[in-house]
């Protein structure tokens, strides 16, 4: 399945210098994602049709079992490592959702567009987080987990897993935006 975000087993050999005010840029990207998360969630479940819009708690609740943890009271370094893991997980999951939606809802162009725009911001965020980890904390490698592979699921499961992931995304991105 496509991975819109492909982290390398990074050594701290950053080709380009990090942006000035890197943490501000990370905060800004998190705020941007948080600002659009609810609209993306609504757009998604609306596009799936029944029974999704009338069963959000059951079908789109944020119960994603293997989602990477986040501790808002950790050190900056610990929070950045956890943020990195979350962004990788979200990025791969979003890639799967986008791929599935192009098959299941080919005419939902505004949804495809919003998914792609979100993936773009996540890509930039990942780059900035890695830059910060490398430049300030000399962390060049973070063990990550990827979002679930939906390629073998049936139509309903694809839709449901996507909805649960976006419900979780909406929830976690608000926490992340506050924590930084």
């Amino acid at each position: 399945s496509p991975l819109p975000i492909t982290p390398v087993n990074a050594t701290c050999a950053i080709r380009h210098p990090c942006h000035n005010n890197l943490m501000n840029q990370i905060r800004s990207q998190l705020a941007q994602l948080n600002g659009s998360a609810n609209a993306l969630f609504i757009l998604y479940y609306t596009a799936q049709g029944e029974p999704f819009p009338n069963n959000l708690d059951k079908l789109c609740g944020p119960n994603v079992t293997d989602f990477p943890p986040f501790h808002a009271n950790g050190t900056e370094k610990a929070k950045l490592v956890e943020l990195y893991r979350i962004v990788v997980y979200l990025g791969t999951s979003l890639g799967n959702i986008t791929r599935d939606q192009k098959i299941l809802n080919p005419s939902a162009l505004s949804l495809h567009s919003k998914l792609n725009a979100t993936a773009d911001i996540l890509r930039g965020l990942l780059s900035n987080v890695l830059c910060r980890l490398c430049s300030k904390y000399h962390v060049g490698h973070v063990d990550v987990t990827y979002g679930p592979d939906t390629s073998g699921k049936d139509v309903f499961q694809k839709k449901k897993l996507g909805c649960q992931l976006l419900g979780k995304y909406k929830q976690i991105i608000a926490v992340l935006a506050q924590a930084f």
Epitope: D149, S151, G152, D154, V155, F156
Partner: antibody, heavy 119, light 106 residues
């Protein structure tokens, strides 16, 4: 492109058997499901199970088939269906069929293999 | 989990007439419904998928419609070669399902 089932025949009640679905002209490495469907003499189509032949190997079973039927991918061109504790009610023609993502229709079917359960 | 009910179980029609077969899902399956034709001693043949898309090589006399829970297959200008059993199949959810096929219409 062709699917061919084999492994059918006469089986004793309470016996087991393994049916094989062999593909030619495709290999099971892309986004396919292979499904097994059976048809008792003079009756309708009854779905048994499906398997995703990609890396995740997702499987789906009809409620009534869970436990006694096991679908698996055994090579890049074969999928098997193991059936245990056979009874006369399992007498049927067993078809394998292929579907592509999003797995909503069975596009290609094999000719079927007849399983007869009798003492 | 969607279960499929097909009506009628059997019917007769004169050559040149029109046949309407109905298929009802116990819950919404969006538009993920397929229709198959099976002649005695043969394997099933896909006629229609996504409720209304004709499969490759199938005559345009076959028309599918519906969405949600109610679906219809219409055969117009019926020919002797159309004598067969027709089955609907939901392709929306395979989890916790007894059968994805309807009972058939002969």
């Amino acid at each position: 492109e062709q699917l061919v089932e084999s492994g059918g025949g006469l089986v004793q009640p309470e016996g087991s058997l393994t049916l094989t679905c062999k593909a030619s002209g495709i290999d099971f490495s892309s986004n396919y499901w292979i499904c097994w469907v059976r048809q008792a003499p003079g009756k309708g189509l009854e779905w048994i199970a499906c398997i995703y032949v990609g890396s995740s190997g997702d499987t789906y079973y009809a409620n009534w088939a869970k436990g006694r039927f096991a679908i698996s991918k055994t090579s890049s061109t074969t999928v098997t269906l193991e059936v245990t504790s056979l009874t006369a009610a399992d007498t049927a023609t067993y078809f394998c069929a292929r579907t592509v993502e999003p797995y909503d229709n069975l596009h290609f079917w094999g000719p079927g293999t007849l399983v007869s359960v009798s003492s | 989990t969607p279960e499929m009910t097909q009506t009628p179980a059997s019917m007769e029609v004169a050559v040149g007439g029109t046949v309407t077969i109905k298929c009802q899902a116990s819950e919404t399956i969006s538009g993920y419904l397929s229709w198959y034709q099976q002649k005695p001693g043969q394997r099933p043949k896909l006629l229609m998928y996504r409720a209304s898309t004709l499969a490759s090589g199938v005559s345009s006399r076959f028309k599918g419609s519906g969405s949600g829970t109610q679906f219809t297959l219409t055969i117009s200008g019926v020919e002797c070669a159309d004598a067969a059993t027709y089955y609907c199949q939901q392709g929306y959810s395979y989890s916790d399902t007894d059968n994805v096929f309807g009972g058939g219409t002969e």
